[in-house]
Interface confidence: low
Amino acid sequence: KNSFTKLSIEPAFTPGPNIELQKDSDCCSCQEKWVGYRCNCYFISSEQKTWNESRHLCASQKSSLLQLQNTDELDFMSSSQQFYWIGLSYSEEHTAWLWENGSALSQYLFPSFETFNTKNCIAYNPNGNALDESCEDKNRYICKQQLI
Amino acid sequence: IPFLEQNNSSPNTRTQKARHCGHCPEEWITYSNSCYYIGKERRTWEESLLACTSKNSSLLSIDNEEEMKFLASILPSSWIGVFRNSSHHPWVTINGLAFKHKIKDSDNAELNCAVLQVNRLKSAQCGSSMIYHCKHKL
């Protein structure tokens, strides 16, 4: 038998002394069913799509396939076993892996990126692993909106 | 009552306030009008309960299947705020309210605290150490 009595806990955060938190706060505004973290919004799909389909679905919501700033950006889901399409593709023109906004992949982000097949797209696991897969394969995907 | 089914398969959803900056502490996440602390450390059920209280929040609760699926997709197995005094007692929330959803392995008299585990709720030994997460509804 457990020694638990009836508990009654309804705590509240204390972000500051007696701060009245407005329900219409405009600081960070995410869409429903998106995750807010460090003032970014993420949509973590449960549906599997090709890389192009994923890119278009994100774009339709004024977001883009995940562009990582660092490998701990998604540390809130670092235990996930899933791989997700991210917004990284190889540019023949620039002979480099580029994010959707045109910036180059940092060599420190994925040390193994030189072994990636340049015809493939990149799937990422939030514990920091990345692998290249045919862009026609279907994976879950993550969209990102930067709010500030 | 069956869990409410909601489709979370595409990002095509209406806009709402996520109340991230002003409403959740740094390093917590927001999802569907709740704040979540994503724990990395392991604790017993009761230690987890107290740890969340010390963070001015409550041990993770699961309100519907959509939430359960979302959390299970990004989190490891973790304690939730549901327990029973013995296998002869009903499952209750940390407020002592009846918990109406199915918990697997409930017939085992040793397992009196509940765990979220890959899209299902399961009973476990309250004294075992598991990851915990905290939640506050906005």
Epitope: E10, A12 | H23, L97
Partner: antibody, heavy 119, light 107 residues
Framework: EVQLVESGGGLVQRGGSLRLSCAAS????????MNWIRQAPGKGLEWVAH????????YYADSVKGRFTISRDNAKNSLSLQMNSLRDEDTAVYYC????????????WGQGTMVTVSS | EIVLTQSPATLSLSPGERATLSCRAS??????LAWYQQKPGQAPRLLIY???NRATGIPARFSGSGSGTDFTLTISSLEPEDFAVYYC?????????FGPGTKVDIK
Amino acid sequence: EVQLVESGGGLVQRGGSLRLSCAASGFTFSSNSMNWIRQAPGKGLEWVAHISSGSSFIYYADSVKGRFTISRDNAKNSLSLQMNSLRDEDTAVYYCARDDWGIDAFNIWGQGTMVTVSS
Amino acid sequence: EIVLTQSPATLSLSPGERATLSCRASQSVSSSLAWYQQKPGQAPRLLIYDASNRATGIPARFSGSGSGTDFTLTISSLEPEDFAVYYCQQRSNWIFTFGPGTKVDIK
């Protein structure tokens, strides 16, 4: 015995102010969110304001926003409602009520205190 | 804001009869709906929370059902003390709303 007792009601002029209090006993007041709910004579119930256990989360009905202020003193097991710029339509019995986290409902109510706004 | 509509406005029944009260939400509230009973000169009393869970001390003749937008409170066999006004209530984004009430009176 779990109890909520309101006080401070009375007759007030239109545009005037009044402060209602609610004394809680028989439970851990500091662990519960609290609310004010009102009922105009012969009418239904209207939720007025909500305050979380630590006073960080405060919400108001649109009809009272900017005029009413909810507050609490956990050391004194006390809930308050400061009502300013009172209008005729604020005439009602005002109840304080406890809501338990997770049930989205008011499970403990006080007996109410009557506020009459006169012109 | 979610609007709750209750029907009928008045229900005239005799003791021992079954009472069925309806509450409809203008949009889905999933199962976040409560029912209260109020007698003249008294504060409301919580009967049902989360659409179907009886509050502490509420007799088994009271039951709640429904989810989404349509909810029902059933009193299986009316006792003399059950004649009162019944309100439904929901919470969405920390805005609580009540229905206008159904009065159950003696026929």
